[in-house]
């Protein structure tokens, strides 16, 4: 990742949207901005709950630790965080519930140290595909971030841009392979539908996945494979109906891993047998004896791991001429 | 916290074991490790247990070691010690995010002599 | 088997002075930057000062700084202080196909005049 000694020189070329920051006199080591509280002993800023409308720019160079939650930030623009000489130390930035609506390409560079970044509980409707690469290069330099919190970002119904939102997270994730280096991603709480088939693959250093309290339906698209390193998957609360066996073989494979699968309305018919077999024997799956059916009706709340062949059948489907209206 | 256990003067030969206590979290969620430290010399890292249990070894330590975990212990077994394995025994919790030790216990002193 | 090889084994600085202490790893470190730094005393374990190359854990003075990448980094200590007295350890972290491998360097002495 990113060097945390950036100089300030690598701003002299920079785009005018600097201008205004990078140009400001450099904040007394000892300054604090209006409404906010300041540790230099901890390296921590907290401006929380104030209805600031814009990132201060009179932070102080000191800061680790930036706590911007419960404001009216709306938009985040391009720099907003730069600063001359650089946020260098600036390692974890939490933004959640700022009602931020849009964040903008580069709205994250210059900040060579950022670990952690959370964004949850703000309505995105605009958030650009360059948002954590900085630039729309094809291979952008690495982020730095290793921790992305992204929980209930979904905007109003009425809100979104007539586009995927699935589809613009997403885009964020993958840019420029910025985010390589990513080990925490949690995308719980967003209405999520399915998950693009192309995202975990390029993000093959994860270690904690959230998926929680989506809607997902199915998995059958999603590969596990590349994900060497995932310890954790948390899938509860969503639409599940059944894993398939292509998924199953593809968690078992991983040494790793923990699955949480807690509260999907499993189908249990014939096309779960596989998976019942798969949840008797693996060790993958924690609080499995918890897991129940919720379809048809005649098996709620059966216990999956209780399930034997003889449990699980499918209605015959009758041929056109025998079906009644 | 963290606490090991277990250490005491034993004979070559005789196997060990030494127990790593873990409290206020999930010995599920984390990886565990054990390092030892000779009097008078370096730390020298021994081996690590997974959350799900998978374990990897220095090489010196395979066949020499094994790393096992309860749902509130993680054990070092021993299995036939030397003078050479006399030491300070700690163990460690890497962190759920990086690879680092971030907890560590007060370790356990191991004296092997005949 | 990977080897952390620290220098120097020791160094003696004055109160206020700068200590630098290398560790050069004989391959890269797990994604480039797995490699942590501890501080221990005499009858105490280690204390972990920086990790991921160059973030300060909790709690650790700004004077410790940490930088490299791949197989060389660097511990520094800006305006010793006496409580600065002791062992510094660096540990990489390593993977492979079969899996998980760590090491400590020899650590490094660190006397404050």
């Known amino acids: 990742s990113s060097s945390p000694t950036s100089s300030a020189s690598s701003f002299s070329s920079s785009a005018p949207f600097l201008a205004s920051a990078v140009s400001a006199q450099p904040p007394l080591p000892d300054q604090c901005p209006a409404l906010c509280e300041c540790s230099e002993a901890a390296r921590t800023v907290k401006c929380v709950n104030r209805n600031l409308t814009e990132v201060p720019t009179d932070l102080p160079a000191y800061v680790r630790n930036l706590f911007l939650t419960g404001n009216q930030l709306a938009v985040l623009p391009a720099g907003a965080f730069a600063r001359r000489p650089p946020l260098a130390e600036l390692a974890a930035l939490n933004l959640s519930g700022s009602r931020l609506d849009e964040v903008r390409a580069g709205a994250f560079e210059h900040l060579p140290s950022l670990r952690q970044l959370d964004l949850s509980h703000n309505p995105l409707a605009d958030l650009s595909p360059f948002a954590f690469s900085g630039s729309n290069a094809s291979v952008s330099a690495p982020s730095p971030l290793v921790e992305l919190i992204l929980n209930h970002i979904v905007p109003p119904e009425d809100e979104r841009q007539n586009r995927s939102f699935e589809g613009m997270v997403v885009a964020a994730l993958l840019a420029g392979r910025a985010l390589q280096g990513l080990r925490r991603l949690e995308l719980a709480s967003n209405h999520f539908l399915y998950l693009p088939r192309d995202v975990l693959a390029q993000l093959p250093s994860l270690r904690h996945l959230d998926l929680s309290n989506n809607s997902l339906v199915s998995l059958t698209y999603v590969s596990f494979r590349n994900l060497t390193h995932l310890e954790s998957l948390h899938l509860e609360d969503n639409a599940l109906k059944v894993l398939h066996n292509g998924t199953l073989a593809e968690l078992q494979g991983l040494p790793h891993i923990r699955v949480f699968l807690d509260n999907n309305p499993w189908v249990c018919d014939c096309h779960m047998a596989d998976m019942v077999t798969w949840l008797k024997e693996t060790e993958v799956v924690q609080g499995k004896d918890r897991l129940t059916c919720a379809y048809p009706e005649k098996m709620r709340n059966r216990v999956l791991l209780e399930l034997n062949s003889a449990d699980l059948d499918c209605d015959p489907i009758l041929p056109p001429s025998l079906q009644t209206s | 916290s963290v606490e090991e256990s277990g250490g005491r003067l034993v004979t070559p030969g005789t196997p060990l074991t030494l127990t790593c206590t873990a409290s206020?979290?999930?010995?599920?969620?984390?990886?565990m490790s054990w390092v030892r430290q000779a009097p008078g010399k370096g730390l020298e890292w021994i081996g690590i247990?997974?959350?799900?249990?998978s374990t990897y070894y220095a090489s010196w330590a395979k066949g020499r070691c094994t790393i096992s975990k309860t749902s509130t212990t993680v054990d070092l077994k021993i299995t036939s010690p030397t003078t050479e394995d006399t030491a300070a025994y700690f163990c460690a919790r890497v962190s759920s995010i990086y690879y680092t030790f971030n907890l560590w216990g007060q370790g356990t002193l191991v004296t092997v002599s005949s | 088997a990977q080897v952390l090889t620290q220098t120097p084994s020791s160094v003696s600085a004055a109160v206020g002075g700068t200590v630098t202490i290398n560790c050069q790893s004989s391959q890269s470190v797990y994604s480039n930057n797995e490699l942590s730094w501890y501080q221990q005393k005499p009858g105490q374990p280690p204390k972990l000062l920086i990790y991921?190359?160059?973030t300060l854990a909790s709690g650790v003075p700004s004077r410790f700084k940490g930088s490299g990448s791949g197989t060389q980094f660097t511990l520094t200590i800006s305006g010793v202080q006496s409580d600065d007295a002791a062992t510094y350890y660096c540990?990489?972290?390593?993977?492979?196909?079969?899996?998980?491998?760590?090491?400590f360097g020899g650590g490094t002495e660190v006397v404050v005049k």
């Open positions: 206020g979290f999930s010995l599920s969620s984390y990886w």
């Open positions: 247990i997974a959350g799900r249990g």
């Open positions: 540990q990489g972290s390593y993977y492979s196909g079969s899996g998980w491998y760590y090491a």
């Open positions: 991921y190359a160059s």
